[in-house]
Every structure is written in structure tokens, then in C-alpha cells.
Amino acid sequence: HNTTVFQGVAGQSLQVSCPYDSMKHWGRRKAWCRQLGEKGPCQRVVSTHNLWLLSFLRRWNGSTAITDDTLGGTLTITLRNLQPHDAGLYQCQSLHGSEADTLRKVLVEVLADPLDHRDAGDLWFPGESESFEDAHVEHSISRSLLEGEIPFPPTS
């Protein structure tokens, strides 16, 4: 899986979308998890409604919401009041039994609020060094790694 980078502004909301094949994943609940390092386990943050037919209902865990358009094949995650500690590697998952298929790997980056000068030195501004080398910018809020490219491994 390539990793898609989504950039959000501190204090604002960030929407992450994960497209999938609606037929292949028919009847499956979805989940959003935070990965503890590139090779680490993925800790569940929030999952869609227990009843698949009600997956369109938004479910919250703290400041993170999930909703699933099962016909259109798009899982949407909302991170409200984005903070620096929300930065990291995540996965959109399709659940079946005790197994989980990865729909998309996502790197969340937190940008500085251009109107907030108090902590301007604490957050990343576009134009400075990025987490990925030669990353292809698709949109202002997301980009994908080139084929075969991996996120910089390690620090803890």
C-alpha cells in the first residue's frame, strides 16, 4: 500500500477519505486505527456502526468521527480540533471476522494556523521539509507517495 498524506490545520477539522470497492467490501464494517510505527500494530480508534446497514450514521470516539457511504464506496473520517499529537500514521480498514484488510494508509500532518501567531514556531508551514522525499502533491490537503516509496523509517 502507498501512503497518502493528509494535511490539516491546527485547531480546525480534517477530513480523510478512503475510497474502496463497494462490491468487494459489501456487508463489511470499517475501522480507523492509529499505527504505532510503520511496522507496528494498528490500534483501533473508531469503527462504524455495529449494524452494517446503519454505517452511514456518524460514530464518534473523542474528537474522531467515522461514517461510511457503503453504496458509493467511500469511508470518511473526521478529526475535529486537530492537534500536533494527532499527527501520525493511520489506516482505514475493512473488517471481516477477526481479520482486517487495509483500504488505505494515511499519514496525517498538522500545519500551523496561519492566523495564530502565538505558537507559530511549533507547527509545520508548507514549504519546509516534508516527511516524505519527492512526494507527489495531489491536492492541497493530500498527496500520495510514488510507487515503491516508503515513509521514512524509524524514530520511535
Epitope: G40, T155, S156
Partner: antibody, heavy 120, light 107 residues
């Protein structure tokens, strides 16, 4: 018990090469990135490079590029660091270090260190 | 390369003291900073990852804070076993780089 065990101390002459091994036990090295970090006597820590044993991908610090080679043998769960064209400034303790990569790894294991002395 | 600058380079403190070590990155590194403790003749030990997360088994008197370019390691009440050298390390980009270290000595 999870641990990384490194090979013993080495004494080398300037211009020679040294190959240090790092054997993992209690876990599979394919599930980790293996880094090499060195520390000259009385000095700080210096990151040299890493390998992903799962696919053999490696990356080196520019300072060591062309002089260091990091490899891994998954069948023996062992990683290796070879440093060539040794000079006296390469005298240091060399550590191997395993983690799950960037972005919040909670796993962190270190070898006991291998002292490499370069002296004529 | 991203330069990591620690201060102070050394400090003397007594058991029970509150100790603060700072680490400054030459570029933005978000929260991708770790703190290590090293004792003479031993390998480093991870204390804090992702700027503020306490590693398993690390006493709660250790805490980390910061994001972007400025980070802090705090020991709320120094214990005899805490006398050691502390290093910060950035994990935003390669090569990973360490601070020069802060040696915490007994006053």
C-alpha cells in the same frame, strides 16, 4: 526473552574493514527496522543507517555513504554492518538498534555494543 | 541534515530536584522526537517517544513536551538512578540525528 546480541570487540588497522553482527532472539527481524548507531569514546550518539530486513531496503547517513554496508540474513535473524577504509576516527562502540519505524514506534531494542578500535 | 541542539550540555543537581533539558531542532519535526537515557558503558534506553509519550516501564517522573522545533524533557524529582546522559533524537527525516547530549551529574 527479547534481545539483540552483537559480536565481540575488534582491533583493526587503518584502511582495513570491519563487519559487526547483531543477532536477534525472541522476535523476528523482518518485523523491525534495524539501525546502526555509533559512539566514539567520550562523544555522543551518531546514526549511521538502517535496513528493512523484510525487503533488504537500506538507507545510510551521507557521512558514511559509500563506506558502510548494512545487510540482513532473515534465516538466521542476524543483521550486519560493514565499515570499510577504516581510520582512527572510526574507533567507537557500534550499536545495533531495532524499532518499528517512524511515526510512533513503541518498540525499542538495543544490542550491548561492539567496540571497534582502529590503530596502527 | 536536521541539527539538534540540546541545552544545557551538563548540569549538576541534587536528589529531589526538578530538572529540565531542552532540545531545539533546526527545522520543523512536528512531534517526531525521542528522548534517550544512557549510562556509562551501557546502550541507550528509550524514555519518551513522539515528544510526550512515556515508553513502557519508564517512571512517571519523566515527561516530555513540545512540538515543531522546541522540546523539553522534565524529571520532576531526580532520583539517584537518574544520573546519566540524556539525548534527544529526531525522526522526521533521514538521517536521524541526535542532540549532543546533556550530562546530569550529582551536585
Amino acid at each position: 526473552q527479547v534481545q539483540l546480541v552483537q559480536s565481540g570487540a575488534e582491533v583493526k588497522k587503518p584502511g582495513a574493514s570491519v563487519k559487526v553482527s547483531c543477532k536477534a532472539s525472541g522476535f523476528s527481524i523482518e518485523d523491525f527496522y534495524i539501525h546502526w548507531v555509533r559512539q566514539a569514546p567520550g562523544q555522543g550518539l551518531e546514526w549511521m543507517g538502517w535496513i528493512d530486513p523484510e525487503n533488504g531496503d537500506s538507507k545510510y547517513a551521507p557521512k558514511f555513504q559509500g563506506r558502510v554496508t548494512i545487510t540482513a540474513d532473515t534465516s538466521t535473524s542476524t543483521a550486519y554492518m560493514e565499515l570499510s577504509s577504516l581510520r582512527s576516527e572510526d574507533t567507537a562502540v557500534y550499536y545495533c538498534h531495532a524499532d518499528h519505524g517512524n511515526y510512533g514506534s513503541t518498540m525499542d531494542y538495543w544490542g550491548q555494543g561492539t567496540l571497534v578500535t582502529v590503530s596502527s | 541534515d536536521i541539527q539538534m541542539t540540546q541545552s544545557p550540555s551538563s548540569l549538576s543537581a541534587s536528589v529531589g530536584d526538578r530538572v529540565t533539558i531542552t532540545c531545539h531542532a533546526s527545522q520543523h519535526i512536528n512531534v517526531w522526537l525521542s528522548w534517550y537515557q544512557q549510562k556509562p558503558g551501557k546502550a541507550p534506553k528509550l524514555l519518551i517517544y513522539k515528544a510526550s509519550n512515556l515508553h513502557t516501564g519508564v517512571p512517571s517522573r519523566f515527561s516530555g513536551s513540545g512540538s515543531g522545533t522546541d522540546f523539553t524533557l522534565t524529571i520532576s524529582s531526580l532520583q539517584p538512578e537518574d544520573f546519566a546522559t540524556y539525548y534527544c533524537q529526531q525522526g522526521q527525516t533521514y538521517p536521524r540525528t541526535f542532540g549532543q547530549g546533556t550530562k546530569v551529574e550529582i551536585k
